[in-house]
Interface confidence: low
C-alpha cells in the first residue's frame, strides 16, 4: 500500500484526497479528476475526513433499553443516548450508554439512603428498630407506632444491586 498523507486515502497504488465530515466517497480520484464526494443521507453520518464508500448508520436510542436521545444524529455526528428519567446507565459501550435500568424501589421498612443519578442506582437502607417507612419512598424513617416492630422485622431487604458490565 502507498504511504498516503493524512488528508489522503489509498486507492490501489495511488493516493486520493479524502472526503470531509458529512460526505462519503462516490467516486475515487483518477489521473485527471479529484475524489467525487456525496453528502450523507438522513439517518447516516461520518464524523471525520474519510475514504469511506458509505456513510455510517446513526445509532437508535431504544426506549425498551431505558434510553432516550440526548443528542440527535446529524450528518457529521452520531446520535448520543442517555438514560430516560428514573433510569441509570448499567452498560457503557465506548462513549455511549447501551442500556439503562430503572432505579430500585425501596421496600416498606426501608428508607432511601441515596437517590438515583444517571450512573448510579438508588441505595436503600433498612429502617432502624423502632422506626418505620410505610412505602419505601421516604429519605428518613419515621418514629414508631405499635406496629413499627412488625414493619421492621417482617419487611424483606431491598435489592439495590447495581451491575457494572
Amino acid at each position: 500500500l502507498p504511504s498516503c498523507k493524512e488528508d489522503e486515502y489509498p486507492v490501489g497504488s495511488e493516493c486520493c484526497p479524502k472526503c470531509g465530515p458529512g460526505f462519503h466517497v462516490r467516486q475515487a480520484c483518477g489521473e485527471q479528476t479529484g475524489t467525487v464526494c456525496e453528502p450523507c443521507s438522513p439517518g447516516t453520518y461520518i464524523a471525520h475526513f474519510n475514504g469511506l464508500s458509505k456513510c455510517l448508520q446513526c445509532q437508535m436510542c431504544d426506549p425498551a433499553m431505558g434510553l432516550r436521545t440526548s443528542r440527535n444524529c446529524s450528518t457529521t455526528a452520531n446520535a448520543l443516548c442517555g438514560c430516560s428519567p428514573g433510569h441509570f446507565c448499567i452498560i457503557q459501550d465506548g462513549d455511549h450508554c447501551a442500556a439503562c435500568r430503572a432505579y430500585a424501589t425501596s421496600s416498606p421498612g426501608q428508607r432511601v439512603q441515596k437517590g438515583g443519578t444517571e450512573s448510579q442506582d438508588t441505595l436503600c437502607q433498612n429502617c432502624p428498630p423502632g422506626t418505620f417507612s410505610s412505602n419505601g419512598t421516604l429519605e428518613e424513617c419515621q418514629h414508631g407506632t405499635k406496629c413499627s416492630k412488625w414493619l421492621v422485622t417482617e419487611a424483606g431487604p431491598g435489592t439495590s444491586s447495581f451491575r457494572w458490565v
Epitope: 446507565c89 442500556a99 441505595l123
Partner: antibody, heavy 113, light 112 residues
Framework: QVQLQQSGAELVRPGTSVKISCKAS????????LGWIKQRPGHGLEWIGD????????KYNEKFKGKATLTIDTSASTAYMQLSRLTSEDSGVYFC??????WGQGTSVTVSS | DVVMTQTPLTLSVTIGQPASISCKSS???????????LNWLLQRPGQSPKRLIY???KLDSGVPDRFTGSGSGTDFTLKISRVEAEDLGVYYC?????????FGGGTKLEIK
C-alpha cells in the same frame, strides 16, 4: 480514552498484608463503578467487589469479606485494594476493571515464605 | 452462587473454520427487568480480559461481526463464523443477573 494503570508485582510473606493500586486516566472516576477481579490458574476469574468512586460505598462478594478492603482516593483518581492475613491461596493476578469495560494490566501477588 | 459451566475446555480449530462455545448457568439469567445479563470475554495470552459481547448478543465497539452471541434462560452460545489467528486465547462467559457476579471456567481456543 480511559486507561487503568495498576501497581507492580508483589512478593509478600504469609500473614502480612498488601495494598495494590489502580490509577485511572479519563472520566471513569465520576460516572462509573470500578471492580476488582482475582485470577488464579485452575480457578478462573472471581469477582471480589465493586467500589463507586462518586459515592464512596462498596459491594463485596461474601467470599472476600474480611479478606479484601476496597478504598478510593478521588483526588488522585486511584482505587486501592488491601488484602490482609495473606496465605498461599491469595496468590494470583488481581485486575481492576471499569464499568465501561476498561481493564488494568493486572497485578501479580505471590505469597511465599 | 450461580455456577457457570463452559464446554468444551479446549477447542482446536483451523483458521477459516467456525467455532462454537457453550455456557450453561445453574439458574435462569433472565432478570426481573426483562434483560439477560450475560457477557462474553476474551483473554488473549499475556493480556487482560476484554469484553466482546454484552446482554447475550450485543457486540462491543470494534468487535468483528464474525462473533455472535445467542441463547436465553440457562443456555448460551458464542459462535465464531471464521476463526482468525487473533482469536486465540481463553473465552469466558460472565453473568451479572445474580449477586455475586460469576464467571465460567473458560474455554481455550487454539489454532490447529
Amino acid at each position: 480514552q480511559v486507561q487503568l494503570q495498576q501497581s507492580g508485582a508483589e512478593l509478600v510473606r504469609p500473614g502480612t498484608s498488601v495494598k495494590i493500586s489502580c490509577k485511572a486516566s479519563g472520566n471513569i472516576f465520576t460516572n462509573s463503578w470500578l471492580g476488582w477481579i482475582k485470577q488464579r490458574p485452575g480457578h478462573g476469574l472471581e469477582w471480589i467487589g465493586d467500589v463507586y468512586p462518586g459515592g464512596g460505598y462498596n459491594k463485596y462478594n461474601e467470599k472476600f469479606k474480611g479478606k479484601a478492603t476496597l478504598t478510593i482516593d478521588t483526588s488522585a483518581s486511584t482505587a486501592y485494594m488491601q488484602l490482609s492475613r495473606l496465605t498461599s491461596e491469595d496468590s494470583g493476578v488481581y485486575f481492576c476493571a471499569g464499568a465501561m469495560d476498561y481493564w488494568g494490566q493486572g497485578t501479580s501477588v505471590t505469597v511465599s515464605s | 452462587d450461580v455456577v457457570m459451566t463452559q464446554t468444551p475446555l479446549t477447542l482446536s480449530v483451523t483458521i477459516g473454520q467456525p467455532a462454537s462455545i457453550s455456557c450453561k448457568s445453574s439458574q435462569s439469567l433472565l432478570d426481573s427487568d426483562g434483560k439477560t445479563y450475560l457477557n462474553w470475554l476474551l483473554q488473549r495470552p499475556g493480556q487482560s480480559p476484554k469484553r466482546l459481547i454484552y446482554l447475550v448478543s450485543k457486540l462491543d465497539s470494534g468487535v468483528p461481526d464474525r462473533f455472535t452471541g445467542s441463547g436465553s434462560g440457562t443456555d448460551f452460545t458464542l459462535k465464531i463464523s471464521r476463526v482468525e489467528a487473533e482469536d486465540l486465547g481463553v473465552y469466558y462467559c460472565w453473568q451479572l443477573t445474580h449477586f455475586p457476579q460469576t464467571f465460567g471456567g473458560g474455554t481455550k481456543l487454539e489454532i490447529k
